[in-house]
């Protein structure tokens, strides 16, 4: 695996990159849970959505999230063909017209009602630094990941390669 400097170098260009197309290359519904198998749930409260990290009761249904995958434009030194591939970014939408959104000023993860084209704050680079788990890095702030803090989602700065495997930024995607 890359050290964090390598990862940041690899994704730094995303600051200036744009999304190749407005349409995603593919979309999948999945439930999102933490490394410790807590579920990410979404609740409508006072006309806005809240995001929770909680243990579900035995037969309680998991909330589904629509993951939309987009190709990013590459800097000219990367060909983006079948050999090198194209960087993929993901947006997460738990309900129609609402997307997870990185609020870098508040270090928070929020659900915002957006129209397409989506703002850069809605895009995340998907990482796989631990078996069966993924991490979501902010397009707008390389080195900053979605993580779990006090039973809520928050933005967490990762400053070393060891911390890329820290449990609070690891998530499991399940299509069942």
């Amino acid at each position: 695996a890359f050290g964090i400097s390598g990862v940041q170098k690899y994704t730094r260009a995303l600051h200036d990159s744009s999304i190749t197309g407005i349409s995603p290359i593919t979309e999948y519904l999945a439930s999102l849970s933490t490394y410790n198998d807590q579920s990410i749930t979404f609740a409508l409260e006072d006309e806005s959505y809240e995001i929770y990290v909680e243990d579900l009761k035995k037969d309680e249904k998991k909330d589904k999230v629509l993951l939309s995958y987009y190709e990013s434009q590459h800097p000219s030194n990367e060909s983006g063909d079948g050999v090198d591939g194209k960087m993929l970014m993901v947006t997460l939408s738990p309900t129609k017209d609402f997307w997870l959104h990185a609020n870098n000023k508040e270090h928070s993860v929020e659900l915002h009602k957006c129209e397409k084209p989506l703002p850069d704050q809605a895009f995340f680079v998907l990482h796989n630094m631990h078996s069966n788990c993924v991490s979501f890095e902010c397009k707008t702030d390389p080195g900053v990941f979605i993580g779990v803090k006090d039973n809520h989602l928050a933005l967490i700065k990762v400053d070393s390669s060891e911390n890329l495997c820290t449990e609070n930024i690891l998530f499991k995607l399940s299509e069942t």
Partner: nanobody
Framework: QVQLVESGGGLVQPGGSLRLSCAAS????????MGWYRQAPGKQRELVAS???????NYADSVKGRFTISRDNAKNTVYLQMNSLRPEETAVYYC?????????????????WGQGTQVTVSS
């Protein structure tokens, strides 16, 4: 890196059958689309059969009812069962896939092609 490897080509008599296989390898997260193309000498590459991103099979009109595409998701493999083959179907058959795979821990998309397998239909 991701790789597609085809197998199953060969010489077959008109009216005969062949089964082609294409296996994808690498740090694969998901295979979005996967299918078969062919290129006869002096002609352009053309679609034979593929799976769309939604998972539905799609066939060229000329092969409908004779060719069947199938896949084994657990093995990241796609197959093409070709029956009632015709001499004009002599070509190099190529596997193509859009593969979402991990590269240095980051998810990337690859429009990948295999090296091709020769199918010759002749008596």
């Amino acid at each position: 890196q991701v790789q597609l490897v085809e197998s199953g080509g060969g010489l077959v008599q008109p009216g005969g059958s062949l089964r082609l296989s294409c296996a994808a390898s690498g740090s694969i997260f998901r295979i979005n689309t996967m299918g078969w193309y062919r290129q006869a000498p002096g002609k352009q590459r053309e679609l034979v059969a593929s799976f769309t991103s939604g998972g539905s099979p799609n066939y060229a009109d000329s092969v409908k009812g004779r060719f069947t595409i199938s896949r084994d998701n657990a093995k990241n493999t796609v197959y093409l069962q070709m029956n009632s083959l015709r001499p004009e179907e002599t070509a190099v058959y190529y596997c193509n896939a859009y593969i979402m795979a991990w590269s240095h821990g980051v998810l990337k998309g690859y429009d990948s092609w295999g090296q091709g397998t020769q199918v010759t239909v002749s008596s």
